[in-house]
Interface confidence: low
């Protein structure tokens, strides 16, 4: 399985913001960024 | 070479309407989340609107000032954002622009583009 | 709405120079705070994401700190194509917020 913070991100994707912002479950985000415009 | 180029802009009565479009090329337009966001003359920054990725079902949001008036949309295919904008008012008036957005995990990509003015005024 | 409140308005500084901006968040953001760059006639710029994290291709002088509410934008060593407008962005929740800007002036 991957692992990866870019696999994990995705598969939470649609739970949670890529960014992490706009956070709509109580995943904890595992990349390091922030929506950035 | 990555670009965002955005094209419709211009002057139009309050009331009116028009369509704003943002060409990309050089990315994988459909991985990202694309915003729109407006500068009014001389002021600051002001967040429009945002339309996610592909893999995110393309879902919407808005800034409250515009909702009901402005719709976001894309067309993949043509690596193409668009902005509805409807029932325009004077304070509708700046120079927008389209940004794109991408989260790999480990970094990120963010992309602007040069801006097209759009004046609302009779 | 969470807003964002940049100080000071205005900051006059020489090349050489360390410039350290403010920006503070009416609620929590944790570290979804985003800084801009942004010179007359030209779209804004990507400088820090996630509240400490430099993009790509941005000099080391520039860095960001902070969490929570209160985060802070720091150029160690002004040059002189570093003044301008700086904005700080909230993406915590929506609707996406920023500052009303910093304008960074030569003294």
């Known amino acids: 399985a991957c692992d990866t913070a870019t696999c994990v991100t995705h598969r939470l994707a649609g739970l949670l913001s890529r960014s992490g912002g706009v956070v709509k479950n109580n995943f904890v985000p595992t990349n390091v960024g922030s929506k950035a415009f | 070479e990555v670009q965002l180029v955005e094209s419709g802009g211009g002057l139009v009565q309050p009331g009116g309407s028009l369509r704003l479009s943002c060409a990309a090329s050089?990315?994988?337009?459909?991985?990202?989340?694309i915003s729109w966001v407006r500068q009014a003359p001389g002021k600051g920054l002001e967040w429009v609107a945002e339309?996610?990725?592909?893999?995110?079902?393309?879902?919407?949001h808005y800034a409250e000032a515009v909702k009901g008036r402005f719709t976001i949309s894309r067309d993949n295919a043509k690596n193409s954002l668009y902005l509805q904008m409807n029932s325009l008012r004077a304070e509708d008036t700046a120079v927008y622009y389209c940004?794109?957005?991408?989260?790999?995990?480990?970094?990120?990509?963010?992309?602007w583009g040069q801006g097209t003015l759009v004046t609302v005024s009779s | 709405e969470i807003v964002l409140t940049q100080s000071p308005a205005t900051l006059s500084l020489s090349p050489g120079e360390r410039a350290t901006l403010s920006c503070k968040a009416s609620?929590?953001?944790?570290?979804?705070v985003s800084w801009y760059q942004q010179k007359p006639g030209q779209a804004p710029r990507l400088l820090i994401y996630?509240?400490?994290n430099r993009y790509l291709g941005i000099p080391a002088r520039f860095s960001g700190s902070g969490s929570g509410t209160d985060f802070t934008l720091t150029i160690s060593s002004l040059e002189p194509e570093d003044f301008a407008v700086y904005y700080c962005?909230?993406?915590?929740?929506?609707?996406?917020?920023f500052g009303q800007g910093t304008k960074l002036e030569i003294k």
């Open positions: 940004n794109g957005y991408f989260d790999y995990g480990l970094a990120i990509q963010n992309y």
């Open positions: 050089g990315f994988t337009f459909s991985n990202y989340w």
């Open positions: 339309i996610r990725s592909e893999s995110d079902a393309s879902a919407t």
């Open positions: 609620k929590r953001v944790t570290t979804y």
């Open positions: 996630g509240a400490s």
């Open positions: 962005s909230q993406s915590y929740n929506y609707p996406y917020t």
